[in-house]
């Protein structure tokens, strides 16, 4: 193992579409991959009227977007399907959504909002 990096050897597996796909619905997935590649866990879910519906969870191949993330956090603003990835065994058991606020640089003089 490389110092300071958690190696991912297994992830929580879940498939909401397990009957159609004829897979297990849930379990633990061993993560395979080239020795020189990093491995990650992922989770995808939907927010249906405030109710969280998990779509898939499992292992994810070497992806720079997942490097050094110990927590599985979606940062995109209101996607149709939420996705997060992380490094470390079973790190996709818990997942969360913290959208990054985009700071836009004003192209002209900033407008000061009027006080109420």
């Amino acid at each position: 193992a490389i110092l300071g990096r958690s190696e991912t050897q297994e992830c929580l597996f879940f498939n909401a579409n397990w009957e159609k796909d004829r897979t297990n619905q849930t379990g633990v997935e061993p993560c395979y991959g080239d020795k020189d590649k990093r491995r990650h866990c992922f989770a995808t879910w939907k927010n249906i009227s405030g109710s969280i519906e998990i779509v898939k969870q499992g292992c994810w191949l070497d992806d720079i977007n997942c490097y050094d993330r110990t927590d599985c956090v979606e940062k995109k603003d209101s996607p149709e399907v939420y996705f997060c990835c992380c490094e470390g065994n079973m790190c996709n058991e818990k997942f969360s959504y913290f959208p990054e606020m985009e700071v836009t640089q004003p192209t002209s003089n900033p407008v000061t909002p009027k006080p109420p």
Partner: antibody, heavy 120, light 107 residues
């Protein structure tokens, strides 16, 4: 070297049968999902069928369901596609492809393809 | 089934040009989006998986971007060996589906 090698293609009459084989080498065959993807002359890629590493789960495109059967023999590192009731529209180059293990499940290794021609 | 629509279906470009190919999914495929290159008479070759990760051995002039339903493959400086047909593919659900392809031809 990681390799896939298809065989079994040829000319067959409408309504006839053909069995394609795909010999795998250079990787742990039994732990990888495998697929057949076809390409009609001058057309794009069409996914045909897939099978899990153990062979316990099989999937088919609607266009071949009930006519084609995918199978594998992990002791021989070989993937098969049994094609029955062949139609003219099944004429294509058939590729076997490995669907790389964890997500996002891309086809990372392809065979060279074998041509199936259905004609009277 | 998830439909994948690619545009343009063909384009003409010169060596050194920046080329952009787009792919749209009929519903969100999250990050389960892959790109392939195919040359005449050859099998397809995986270029990019998971929207933006280059497969081993693929030159860095290739890049992928996008999210959800809209994706882009960019070749920053077209090389002679890049003239080929490019396909997007979703692996979010079964059946796996491909875009119709984009043929990149020499101008």
């Amino acid at each position: 070297e990681v390799q896939l090698l298809e065989s079994g293609g040829g000319l067959v009459q409408p309504g006839g049968s053909l069995r394609l084989s795909c010999a795998a080498s250079g990787f742990t065959f039994s732990s990888q999902g495998m697929s057949w993807v076809r390409q009609a002359p001058g057309k794009g890629l069409e996914w045909v069928s897939a099978i899990s590493g153990s062979g316990g789960s099989r999937y088919y495109a609607d266009s071949v369901k009930g006519r084609f059967t995918i199978s594998r023999d992990n002791s021989k590192n070989t993937l098969y596609l049994q094609m029955n009731s062949l139609r003219a529209e099944d004429t294509a180059v058939y590729y076997c492809a490995r669907e790389q293990g964890p997500g996002p499940y891309a086809f990372d290794i392809w065979g060279q393809g074998t041509l199936v021609t259905v004609s009277s | 089934d998830i439909q994948m629509t690619q545009s343009p279906s063909s384009l003409s470009a010169s060596v050194g040009d920046r080329v952009t190919i787009t792919c749209r999914a009929s519903q969100s495929v999250s990050r389960f989006l892959n790109w392939y290159q195919q040359k005449p008479g050859k099998a397809p070759k995986l270029l990019i998986y998971g929207i933006s990760t280059l497969q081993s051995g693929v030159p860095s002039r290739f890049s992928g971007s996008g999210s959800g339903t809209d994706f882009t493959l960019t070749i920053s400086s077209l090389q002679p060996e890049d003239f080929a047909t490019y396909y997007c593919q979703q692996s979010f659900s079964l059946p796996r589906t491909f875009g119709g392809g984009t043929k990149v031809e020499i101008k």
